[in-house]
């Protein structure tokens, strides 16, 4: 027997392909989604971070350390930043 | 003007501990945070860590696990201690001090080439 | 991490010319915490600029940054034979401090 395999070529429309992974956007406090290959992006707004931005709180991304402080810490969700303060400077923000 | 002079054994065979000290003259060891950068003509500049007198202490996290930096108040010196090295730690190490309005390197060392082999 | 993307890799000009060097950083870089560095053979390197934009004491003044967020620029002037070097930027805003690759400025 000799299957023969028809290719066809078929133009889909945006209403064919169900809902994306930004439908609805899955981002809190503002944020804003974008598609990636895999699933979607959440860009926080300033204070807010976690993957869908439902963390309240400060990270190293929002600049918390003045007078030429380094933040360390604050890349993950579950960890507070620290700032190491150049001397002369003290205080969480080395204000 | 801060003066900075590494010394240290220029081979150390694999799967050894690394140890280079930086002497300071012109300045106070308690009035700078130190530091360490390594440089190899693949990776180009790296920074390995650095500390303060105070005890604040930070270290790049890939090398984190076998990164020692003390200093020696009494002595006005500090020093780098790297374990188990490989031929991937062959390279330029430099001591610094970070300035006083933020965490730049102001003042380095010569710099002294740190081979890793057998 | 911070990764720092210098360009050109290597730029070739004439003594006299403008040499504009750019490094651009993955993320925005808080309150322009960025500095340059100047390496010749056989040399530590050497602060240029700190800031984004003040240079470092002793730096002559053909020598300027700029820039803030993810984009800075070192620009000198008018260059001169000495110039001629490896140039090197460093974010110090957030943990791991780190460096670009470097760009070289070559003779022409």
């Known amino acids: 027997d000799h299957h023969h395999h028809h290719h066809e070529q078929k133009l889909i429309s945006e209403e064919d392909l169900g809902p994306g992974p930004c439908d609805g956007n899955p981002c809190a406090n503002g944020g804003s989604c974008s598609e990636t290959p895999r699933s979607f992006e959440c860009t926080c707004p300033r204070g807010f971070y976690g993957l869908r931005c439902e963390v309240s709180g400060v990270t190293c991304a929002d600049g918390p350390c003045f007078n030429g402080g380094l933040c360390v810490g604050g890349a993950d969700p579950d960890s507070a930043y620290i700032c190491h303060c150049p001397p002369g400077f003290q205080g969480s923000n080395c204000e | 003007q801060v003066h900075l002079q590494e010394s240290g054994p220029g081979l150390v065979k694999p799967s050894e501990t690394l140890s280079l000290t930086c002497t300071v003259s012109?300045?106070?060891?308690?009035?700078?945070?130190w530091s360490w950068i390594r440089q190899t003509p693949g990776k180009g500049l790296d920074w390995i860590g650095y500390?303060?007198?105070?005890?604040?202490?930070n270290y790049n996290p890939s090398l984190k696990s076998r990164v020692t930096i003390s200093l020696d108040m009494s002595n006005n010196q500090f020093s780098l201690k790297l374990s188990s090295v490989t031929a991937a730690d062959t390279a330029i190490y430099y001591c610094?001090?970070?300035?006083?309005?933020?965490?730049?390197?102001?003042?380095w060392g010569q710099g002294t080439l740190v081979t890793v082999s057998s | 991490e911070i990764v720092l993307t210098q360009s050109p890799g290597t730029l070739s000009l004439s003594p006299g010319e403008r040499a504009t060097l750019s490094c651009r950083a993955s993320?925005?870089?808080?309150?322009?915490?960025l500095a340059w560095y100047q390496q010749k053979p056989g040399q530590a390197p050497r602060l240029l600029i700190y800031?984004?934009?003040s240079r470092a004491t002793g730096i002559p003044d053909r020598f300027s940054g700029s820039g803030s967020g993810t984009d800075f620029t070192l620009t000198i002037s008018r260059l001169e034979p000495e110039d001629f070097a490896v140039y090197y930027c460093?974010?110090?805003?957030?943990?791991?401090?780190?460096f670009g690759q470097g760009t070289r400025l070559e003779i022409k």
């Open positions: 610094a001090s970070i300035g006083v309005a933020g965490f730049y390197f102001d003042y």
């Open positions: 012109g300045g106070s060891i308690s009035s700078y945070y």
């Open positions: 500390r303060y007198y105070s005890g604040n202490t």
């Open positions: 993320q925005s870089i808080s309150r322009s915490y």
């Open positions: 800031g984004a934009s």
């Open positions: 460093q974010q110090y805003g957030t943990s791991p401090i780190t």
